[in-house]
């Protein structure tokens, strides 16, 4: 680059400008450090807060005591009035004690309010205790009867084995298939007799399920049963029975296949109202 | 309060100072990196330098002076306020003393009045008792009350026994019922997966059954034998 | 001092950057101060409000105390008055005390009161015992657990079983009826055939 001599006025200007601005910065710093930005110490801040809080607490206490004193004074006023009434009564009593006709009235005077109130309370409590004992007794008897009934019911309920459960599911499937065939046969006969033309189609798969769909459904069920039984057996052998055994990939595929084939109907009790009581778990 | 001016939000003063310091012009920019080692002519250099210092002066130094003055003003205001509050608190402290003294005086005065009142009421009772005890008769209603009350203790004995029996009965039944409850119930533990499978099969079978019931009812409705 | 040689852009830039940093540093200092002032700001505002309410409360309490003091003075003066009324009556009783004897009726009354107190206490105890028993019965009667999934499964299976029995019975019934109808139809058909043959023969 070019070289300039110190005497060059522009160069001198540059130097001067730098020096001046540097000085300005120093002056700014000096001004700032000289400025007082301190409101107070953190102790003071804390003291202000705690002091007003303490005063507030104190005021609450004193308010409480004045309020309670106010109540006390009110009751003192009341007893004072009672006192004046008492003096009046004593005066009258003294007068009456001198009156002969008064004695007759004494026999007819009612109970004093305190005794009257106490007598009423005794009657009330007496009634309450008498009936409550009876009620509690009845409730206990009722609970006991219910308990015995429950016990009897429980004895009659046989909790099925796991296999029974799965067999029942499989049996039901079998029965459903048989009944389906039978119904289909019946519908055919009725249609041949021209007595009936089918109006309600099966909402599942098709009007009359094809053999193949029934077959695949059954094989799904069978493989599911096996899978369930297999998980059972495996979970017995393991030390932690809570952990369910995983299905084999093939079984999972079968199950997926089976589940995918159908719409998911809502769960509801399917027994028509006229059917007799439940049969599966009761001892015949 | 004079403090309210800036105290709308918890950090409002800080924001205020931030906005005072906010710059409206960017710092002077320079040439591309490739030209950085070139020395410009001194005139241009001086001009660039003057422009930069002018920007610093207007955008930083002036604004910082303004911020400084603003903080100082606020500090002065706060100091006055603090001083006033400290004075207020010391006044409250004095008041606290006098309130406590007054409360104690009132409590003493009340105790005195209460004791006096109790004394008066006792004298009153005695007086009334004296006048009443000159009356030789029990009224009819008092006699009836007495009779009624005398019959009760016997009944209470019976009731007491009944309560005892009820309590024993309750304890006995509870014991028996708890025993039954604590018996281990035979049950199959089904995993969540098994439950899900069974549920889906039951759903499926239920649907089939429902359809068949529907079909039979349909036949019965349509076919008149 | 003046530079001995011309400044490059880079030197100029680094000088300006140095100043920038210094000024920004200074700016940060202001913001820190502002933060501290802000804390005081908040403290004094909150405290100011507290103190204002303290003043209000102090004045209120003072007023209350003054009122109570006046009331107590009034009570004491009334008590004095009451005592002045009592004294002559007490004197009267003293004079008569020679002729008065505590009579039977009063003892009877006293006994009756005591009996009533006694019975009341006993009944209260009994009532409490019964309340405890009732409370106990109410809390212990929890419903049986019907949420057992197995029970639900069994219920559904039973319902299914019932339904299947119903289907079985009804389809059997329908089957029988169909067979009967088929027989009747068959009979009619044969009858028709015979009459048909006779006609043509």
């Amino acid at each position: 680059g070019h070289q300039w001599k110190d005497s060059d006025p522009v160069m001198a200007g540059i130097g001067e400008e730098i020096a001046h601005f540097q000085k300005e910065l120093e002056e700014l710093k000096a001004r700032t450090s000289k400025a007082c930005f301190q409101v107070g110490t953190s102790e003071e801040m804390k003291m202000l807060r705690t002091e007003s809080d303490d005063l507030h607490t104190f005021l609450l206490e004193i308010k409480e005591t004045t309020e309670s004193l106010h109540g006390d004074i009110s009751s003192l006023k009341t007893t004072l009035l009672e006192g004046f009434a008492g003096v009046e009564e004593a005066r009258e009593q003294n007068e009456r004690n001198r009156d002969s006709g008064y004695l007759h009235l004494l026999y007819k005077r009612p109970l004093d309010p305190k005794s009257e109130a106490q007598l009423q309370e005794i009657r009330r409590l007496h009634q309450y205790v008498k009936f409550a004992v009876q009620d509690v007794n009845d409730v206990l008897d009722l609970e006991w009867d219910q308990h015995l009934e429950q016990k009897k019911k429980q004895r009659h309920l046989l909790v099925p084995e796991r296999e029974t459960l799965f067999n029942t599911l499989a049996n039901n499937r079998e029965i459903i298939n048989q009944q389906r065939k039978r119904l289909n046969h019946l519908v055919d006969s009725l249609q041949q007799l021209r007595l009936y033309k089918q109006t309600s189609l099966w909402s599942l798969s098709s009007a009359v399920p094809s053999q193949s769909s029934i077959h695949s459904f059954d094989s799904d069920l069978e493989s599911l049963c096996n899978a369930l039984l297999k998980t059972t057996i495996e979970s017995h052998t393991k030390s932690l029975p809570k952990v369910p055994a995983k299905l084999s990939p093939m079984k999972q595929a079968q199950l997926r296949n089976f589940l995918a084939k159908r719409k998911t109907p809502p769960v509801r009790s399917t027994a028509p109202a006229s059917l007799s009581r439940s049969a599966f778990l009761s001892q015949r | 309060s004079p403090l309210r001016v800036l105290a709308e939000t918890p950090d409002s003063f800080e924001k205020h100072i931030r906005s005072i310091l906010q710059r409206s012009v960017a710092n002077p920019a320079f040439l591309k990196a490739s030209e950085k080692d070139i020395a410009p002519p001194p005139e241009e250099c001086l001009q660039l330098l003057s422009r930069a210092t002018q920007v610093f002066r207007e955008q930083y130094i002036l604004k910082q002076d303004l911020a400084k003055e603003e903080i100082q003003r606020r500090v002065k205001l706060l100091c006055d306020q603090k001083k006033k509050q400290l004075e207020d608190l010391s006044y409250c402290r004095e008041e606290r003393k006098s309130l406590r003294e007054m409360a104690e005086r009132l409590a003493d005065k009340y105790e005195e009045a209460k004791e006096k009142q109790e004394d008066i009421m006792n004298r009153m009772k005695k007086l009334l008792h004296s006048f009443h005890s000159e009356l030789p008769v029990l009224s009819d209603s008092e006699r009836d009350m007495k009779k009624e009350l005398q019959l009760i203790p016997d009944q209470l004995r019976h009731l007491g026994n009944a309560i005892k029996q009820v309590t024993m009965k309750k304890d006995y039944q509870q014991q028996k019922m708890e025993k039954v409850l604590s018996l281990p119930k035979p049950t199959i533990i089904l995993s969540a997966y098994q439950r899900k499978c069974i549920q889906s099969i039951l759903k499926e079978e239920g649907e089939h059954i429902r359809e068949m019931v529907k079909q039979i009812n349909d036949i019965r409705n349509h076919v008149n034998f | 001092a003046a530079a001995s040689s011309a400044m490059t852009y880079a030197q100029l830039e680094s000088l300006i950057n140095k100043w920038s940093l210094e000024l920004e540093d200074q700016e940060r200092h202001f913001l820190q101060q502002a933060t501290q002032v802000n804390a005081w700001d908040r403290t004094l505002i909150e405290n100011g409000e507290k103190i204002t309410s303290l003043h209000r409360e102090v004045e209120k309490v003072k007023l209350d105390q003054k009122r109570l003091d006046q009331e107590l003075d009034f009570i004491l003066s009334q008590q004095k008055e009451l005592e002045d009324l009592l004294s002559p009556l007490e004197e009267l009783v003293k004079e008569q005390s020679g002729t008065i004897y505590l009579q039977h009726a009063d003892e009877e009354r006293e006994k009756t009161y005591k009996l009533a107190e006694n019975i009341d206490a006993q009944l209260k105890r009994m009532a409490q015992d019964l309340k405890d028993i009732i409370e106990h019965l109410n809390t212990s009667g929890a419903p049986a657990d019907t949420s057992d999934p197995l029970q639900q499964i069994c219920k559904i299976l039973n319902a299914h079983m019932d339904s299947l029995q119903w289907i079985d019975q009804n389809s059997a019934l329908l089957q029988r009826k169909v067979e009967e109808v088929t027989k009747v139809c068959e009979g009619r058909r044969k009858e028709q055939e015979r009459s048909f043959r006779i006609t043509f023969d």
């Epitope: - | 002076d65 303004l66 003055e69 | -």
Partner: nanobody, 115 residues
Framework: QVQLVESGGGLVQPGGSLRLSCAAS????????MAWYRQAPGNQRQLVAY???????VYASSARGRFTISRDNAKNTVTLQMNSLLLDDTAVYYC?????????YGQGTQVTVSS
């Protein structure tokens, strides 16, 4: 309301001197930092000098050594003494009062330096 009235402008030869004055009213003078700005035709408004409430002064490079800013808090005035005037000093000079985010300007006074 806030008012800033500048005076003392005029025509002056290079090297000559001028004293600009600014009378302030409508606000608490001691709370404000007072500044002088100038604007030459076709240029942006540029800070010349300012004086803080406590009397600290800051000058633009171009004004340093030639101009002097001062304030009289008793009279609510601020003055700018300009010596050794140059042709480049020709501009409209504005008085400004600043406090926090508040910023007020006067109408300006013309200074012309010409030979």
């Amino acid at each position: 309301q806030v008012q800033l009235v500048e005076s003392g402008g005029g025509l002056v030869q290079p090297g000559g001197s001028l004293r600009l004055s600014c009378a302030a009213s409508g606000f608490t003078f001691t709370d404000y930092l007072m500044a002088w700005y100038r604007q030459a035709p076709g240029n942006q408004r540029q800070l010349v000098a300012y004086i803080t409430s406590d009397g600290s002064t800051v000058y633009a490079s171009s004004a340093r050594g030639r101009f002097t800013i001062s304030r009289d808090n008793a009279k609510n005035t601020v003055t700018l003494q300009m010596n050794s005037l140059l042709l480049d000093d020709t501009a409209v000079y504005y008085c400004s009062a600043k406090s926090g985010l508040k910023d007020y300007y006067g109408q300006g006074t013309q200074v012309t330096v010409s030979s």
